[in-house]
Interface confidence: medium
Amino acid sequence: IVLRPSRVHNSEENTMRALTLKDILNGTFSYKTFFPNWISGQEYLHQSADNNIVLYNIETGQSYTILSNRTMKSVNASNYGLSPDRQFVYLESDYSKLWRYSYTATYYIYDLSNGEFVRGNELPRPIQYLCWSPVGSKLAYVYQNNIYLKQRPGDPPFQITFNGRENKIFNGIPDWVYEEEMLATKYALWWSPNGKFLAYAEFNDTDIPVIAYSYYGDEQYPRTINIPYPKAGAKNPVVRIFIIDTTYPAYVGPQEVPVPAMIASSDYYFSWLTWVTDERVCLQWLKRVQNVSVLSICDFREDWQTWDCPKTQEHIEESRTGWAGGFFVSTPVFSYDAISYYKIFSDKDGYKHIHYIKDTVENAIQITSGKWEAINIFRVTQDSLFYSSNEFEEYPGRRNIYRISIGSYPPSKKCVTCHLRKERCQYYTASFSDYAKYYALVCYGPGIPISTLHDGRTDQEIKILEENKELENALKNIQLPKEEIKKLEVDEITLWYKMILPPQFDRSKKYPLLIQVYGGPCSQSVRSVFAVNWISYLASKEGMVIALVDGRGTAFQGDKLLYAVYRKLGVYEVEDQITAVRKFIEMGFIDEKRIAIWGWSYGGYVSSLALASGTGLFKCGIAVAPVSSWEYYASVYTERFMGLPTKDDNLEHYKNSTVMARAEYFRNVDYLLIHGTADDNVHFQNSAQIAKALVNAQVDFQAMWYSDQNHGLSGLSTNHLYTHMTHFLKQCFSLSD
């Protein structure tokens, strides 16, 4: 299936040009998306190109500026947040990144009624997290690991927690491992629907071992960065959940929510919190051995001012073939009765589907079914359930939005997006207004991305929000590579792959092949999305064929494929890349003397193991910021898939699956190893150990470090990185510079 046919015709060839590396590094062909910032059923805010904050009313067709770019500029604001009562806006400036999601910032409160900044009782700086209540204009914020509450922006703050301490106790914000591997947010506090209560997590990292690395900066002495970071098998954070009445916060203070007994009996995690009503909350917990999850529905007891979580409202989700959930355990979407909910989990055939739970998980009603997977529940209204799946035409790398009419009998299912712009759009997400009155669809490809606004009742398109016209025009004279998504059937395993082919691809010729791999558990690389990136350039200008392959361990094709890697990372992911390469060679257009593999992070681990597989298939390869031993990576992620590194559990495979154990096998390949020295995620230690093992085995290799760079290798390092990797590959493939 050719997804993005090249627009090259002989008559046009003179005016068409190939992509250049400079195009990629400058972001010349980047695209825009439009996600409305919904503030009601029919209104949304959007930051205009000239930085005004504009309110749009879909029904009246009117728009007006609620905050001028002049006001934004007066405090150098880069972000904003309107209070639900529309009286105030917070303006965010001095953004300072911490980890993947977390950052600190300075916040100013602007009073829309009088057009002035709120003076008196200003917020401290820098703040770690700040948010409005869902109703009115109460503020909750985290400063120096403690939570504060303001009834109104100009009021003095009420301090909720007092034990916050850097790198020791975190209130309302996650520690490193919870941020990266469990919550995937910068916050750990949640307002109840009407703002009566505020729930928050407290993480105690007192006993967690600390990772320390040098940050060189430009001082005479480097700084040492210390992060409590539990590696596999190490002591984990201790988590507690509290809820405080924000109307009378001093009355009884924060009340702890009890942990289910079956969870509390050994090490455990808190995985998410979902408010149902102001007086009902749902907490999800997970055993440290992550195959048992418990969903606990708790009710406020007015007489005792406590939270009660009856055993009858505990729902257990257990996996017997792998870990609980996909990447994370799914979260519930509650129905209007405030007790039943919809949730995605594996059905009896091992496919993730939507289930409706009223009393017990055993009595769950399966809502979707088939040899495909439901991926996200966007919204449940009284009449409809909106979700995404990869059902359409049996392509796992697509995403379409569906609506099930749950208010009628028999319920009907409709694909909202399947036939809208079929060639251009096969990978969607959606954003819904209150009560799903309207929604935005954001299409990511395979054609040029487009964002549109729709009526939630009829699904009619109302208007185009962003269609990337400039990008479309800019690409008119570019020789883009061809892309195809197909599958290989090998030993009862389906291997989907994406192949990126040079513009004038000719099956009778031989091309160098580059495998790009990620391959981590529950990931997906073969997706029907638009991208003009480094590998597009390598195909367009340098004439390489690039392939991405989703092997065992990858997502959205059922549990058999997903859980195949359980407790044995580094085996089947590598095997499947190798199998695919052999199949590509059989296709006849690959030069088998010029095959390379590269990957980043988990992909760096897989590419390293593939290079060291001893197959002789690969001439060279690159590993960027690779994991080299699972003993070096975070507990929450690693143990989910590998169990514990103990003798009575899975220590043997932890030891067998290291890159270092295969040092000798790098002798006959050209290996480029790259890592940032300030990588908080996959520590530089990983590459340091690979390098040490290679030196000890007297194996030659190439390496590049990026001083003070983290796992993303951003800024000028990005340019240097891709330039360096390009030179390496061109040398490997004997391509002239």
């Epitope: 009449d383 009628s408 009998y409 319920p411």
Partner: nanobody, 118 residues
Framework: EVQLVESGGGLVQPGGSLRLSCAAS????????MGWFRQAPGKGRELVAA????????YYPDSVEGRFTISRDNAKRMVYLQMNSLRAEDTAVYYC???????????WGQGTQVTVSS
Amino acid sequence: EVQLVESGGGLVQPGGSLRLSCAASGRTFSYNPMGWFRQAPGKGRELVAAISRTGGSTYYPDSVEGRFTISRDNAKRMVYLQMNSLRAEDTAVYYCAAADFPMHFNYWGQGTQVTVSS
């Protein structure tokens, strides 16, 4: 939980009409799709009418389409089945039912007998 009590059954001549009522208790009533089923002697239970939570959409099998009408009053927590042009084959015990999810009726009343005979 939803408790359901039917009334309005009885003996009626062919071609006649009858209105069945179902009183519901339980706080989740307005969130439940509702239905009427019937069971004739020696036969299985058959759905004869269903209505959505809001009352905005209804369903009837071909056998009763145009003769039976289902309606609901969420404020009074009542569901009704208006049966016109009754036939002998409509004779059965009629049950009111509430669903968790549209295709899944799992709360049932005790039933009310309807007999169509001359």
